[in-house]
């Protein structure tokens, strides 16, 4: 059998195989050692007994989408049946005091591979044996502690495979420079040691995407905005836009990145090299936000120019080459033939990313201030608690609710939270009455809210002992 017979249904065309060559990967036309690595079809009854105590689930994830030319990393994590885990030696053991359907196990091991490898014979002086090989016959790499690695992972995509020895989780990175744009399929088959052979325990597949567009996300934050995920924001308060470029392999680390913003409110284009920008909308309504990100990224070099006729040099040719290749020298003397390509040149290509959002701007509570605090006189004898009125002003829209959070002087340990609807006139002046149990210093967070906004103010308040002569003080 060949690898492609074992690993996948998807057969890429000859063109795809030729043009999607992955560095360090092998062609799936290679032979598969079915004696050491038996192949079971889906639904084969043997899968049921491939693992003691249930089925192992493999979870395959990737940091897709990947900008073409960058590295994409795949991670496989094995999830064992309940109460099972991998120990420091790579053996599979039962978790202590964990009860599964079979109850508590007397034997601490599910698989004691250390014992198997110690019993193993047929080793030569290098510790290599005929069974410590991958499905294509290549020997296992002898990293320190390789004997504790008891799972064999075979990755398969684009007509090629990659084999890896590992523990219950492995990672593989692939450079995408030669990968066709668009969605691709990665399939992984996992085997476990079984004496001097291997048993399949899991298969998993996942789609990954290679793109020539920079993957761009924008987070938006605005003070007093009640719900940052609904793309509704408040008039007259700055919104902070933060651009996140999905570049987990740091492919663009040395690129100059430009951000071109259009906020949709006739304020024109704003170009910046900073990934954050603030913008304030001064009108209510719906606006179309557009962002274009441009980065000069390492990319394919242009095809060599046809040999020019021996006439006057062509300045545009030099310019063309320079636009791709910062290392290309200008013409030397008057001989255009000296523009020949330099080996191992670093060519650059402009990559773009786009983000578009429709944002709604509405009125909101812009500011809230406590302008006065009054101790409410209570009938004698003085009770344990104090009543305090906070006179509060606000700017912007009319609040509909008030919340007070009373906490310790560090403002960290909440003692009491009270929210209630409020009726406020157009002047936005209201009095909030709250009870304080006993004297001392309190942190008071007071928020005024409406449908779209939540404005906060804080103060430290010193509540005196219940002596009519003691004044109420703002601690700050």
């Amino acid at each position: 059998k060949r690898f492609h017979d074992v690993l996948g249904n998807e057969r890429p065309s000859a063109y795809m195989r030729e043009h999607n060559q992955l560095n360090g990967w092998s062609s799936d036309e290679n032979d598969w050692n079915e004696k050491l690595y038996p192949v079971w079809k889906r639904g084969d009854m043997r899968w049921k007994n491939s693992w003691k105590g249930g089925r192992v689930q493999a979870v395959l994830t990737s940091d897709s989408p990947a900008l073409v030319g960058s590295n994409i990393t795949f991670a496989v994590n094995l999830i064992f049946p309940r109460c099972q885990k991998e120990d420091a030696n790579g053996n599979i053991v039962y978790e202590k005091n964990c009860r599964n359907e079979a109850g508590l196990s007397a034997d601490p091991y599910v698989y004691n591979w250390t014992a198997w490898s110690e019993d193993s014979d047929g080793e030569n002086g290098t510790g290599q044996s005929h069974h410590n090989v991958f499905p294509d016959g290549k020997p296992f790499p002898h990293h320190p502690g390789w004997r504790r690695w008891n799972f064999i992972y075979v990755f398969h995509t684009l007509g090629q495979y990659f084999q890896k020895l590992g523990r219950c989780s492995v990672r593989v990175s692939v450079n995408t420079a030669n990968v066709t744009l668009g969605p691709q399929l990665m399939e992984v088959t996992v085997y476990r040691r079984h004496g001097r052979a291997y048993v399949p325990i899991a298969q998993v597949k996942d789609v990954y995407v290679v793109t020539d567009q920079i993957p761009v996300f924008v987070t938006m934050f605005q003070k007093n905005d009640r719900n940052s995920s609904d793309e509704t924001f408040l008039k007259d308060l700055p919104i902070m836009f933060d651009v996140l470029i999905h570049d987990p392999s740091h492919f663009l680390n040395y690129s100059t990145i430009n951000y071109k913003w259009s906020f949709g409110d006739n304020t024109g284009l704003f170009v910046s090299t900073n990934h954050t920008v603030n913008h304030t909308y001064v009108l209510n309504g719906t606006f179309s936000l557009n962002l274009t990100v441009k980065a000069a990224a390492p990319g394919p070099c242009p095809p060599p120019p046809p040999p020019p006729r021996p006439s006057k040099p062509t300045p545009s040719l030099a310019t063309t080459l320079k636009s791709y290749d910062s290392n290309t020298p200008g013409p030397a003397g008057d001989n255009p033939l000296e523009l020949s390509r330099i080996p191992d040149e670093n060519c650059q290509i402009n990559r773009y990313g786009h983000f578009q959002a429709t944002i709604t701007i509405v009125e909101g509570i812009l500011e809230v201030n406590i302008i006065q605090m009054t101790d409410v006189l209570m009938p004698v004898p003085w009770p344990e608690s104090s009543l305090i009125d906070f006179v509060v002003t606000c700017q912007g829209s009319i609040p509909t609710e008030v919340c007070t959070i009373i906490s310790d002087p560090t403002c960290e340990i909440t003692q009491n939270t009270v929210c209630s609807p409020v009726d406020v006139d157009e002047m936005c002046l209201l009095t909030v009455r709250r009870t304080f149990n006993g004297s001392g210093t309190y942190c008071v967070n007071l928020t005024l809210g409406d449908d779209t906004s939540l404005a906060l103010t804080s103060t430290l308040i010193s509540v005196p002992d219940r002596d009519p002569a003691s004044p109420l003080r703002m601690a700050n």
Partner: antibody, heavy 116, light 110 residues
């Protein structure tokens, strides 16, 4: 002068529906939260529901949650209470009131009778 | 069973001072304003006291409100026959997220 005028009450069978309206005048309706309060015959006052000035926040008594819906049309200065799945215990005079942290103005009420 | 507790009845002779109590908890009276409502027979309720102890315009100063901890009270001095009515206390309850009333207190002027 602030005026609140309820309408839409009447006799309805259990399980039936009714929509009450409250026409407001004498104040800037869109600046105020509004509420419905009811009073069963010979009984005390029971708050039913409240709505913020813009209509974005709504509160309901547990006894009517999921059956009644409060709404408002600020362009018409009108408050509504849509009552579905009515029960005999919903029989009451329904008052429309201004504000929601206190009720400073009340309408004269409209009688809703739920009976077969 | 009302969340706020009021006596079912109160009485007094003309000119006398009468007090009606209203008892609740920290989630209503303790941390929110208390209002008092008067309902004359056959009419809609009317706001007497709000944001303890404020009075809307048109309400005589014979009516006053006070609050101590989780209890509130309405005092009527110089009692008159036209004060004979049902009286209700009310407050927002922050735990229930609901406005709560006391059971009515029937005031009789003897």
């Amino acid at each position: 002068e602030v005026q609140l005028l309820e309408s839409g009450g009447g006799l309805v069978q259990p399980g039936g529906s009714l929509r009450l309206s409250c026409a407001a005048s004498g104040f800037t309706f869109s600046n105020y939260a509004m509420s419905w309060v009811r009073q069963a015959p010979g009984k005390g006052l029971e708050w039913v529901s409240s709505i913020s000035h813009s209509g974005g926040s709504k509160y309901y008594a547990d006894s009517v949650k999921g059956r009644f819906t409060i709404s408002r049309d600020n362009s018409k200065n009108t408050l509504y209470l849509q009552m579905n799945s009515l029960r005999a215990e919903d029989t009451a005079v329904y008052y429309c009131a201004r504000k929601w942290s206190t009720f400073d103005y009340w309408g004269q009420g409209t009688l809703v009778t739920v009976s077969s | 069973q009302s969340v706020l507790t009021q006596p079912p009845s109160a009485s007094g002779t003309p000119g006398q001072r009468v007090t009606i109590s209203c008892s609740g908890s920290s989630s209503n009276i303790g941390n929110n304003y208390v209002s008092w409502y008067q309902q004359l027979p056959g009419t809609a309720p009317k706001l007497l006291i709000y944001d303890t102890p404020l009075r809307p315009s048109g309400v005589p100063d014979r009516f006053s409100g006070s609050k101590s901890g989780t209890s509130a009270s309405l005092a009527i001095s110089g009692l008159r026959s036209e004060d004979e009515a049902d009286y209700y206390c009310g407050a927002w309850d922050s735990s229930l997220n609901a406005y709560v009333f006391g059971g009515d207190t029937k005031l009789t002027v003897l």
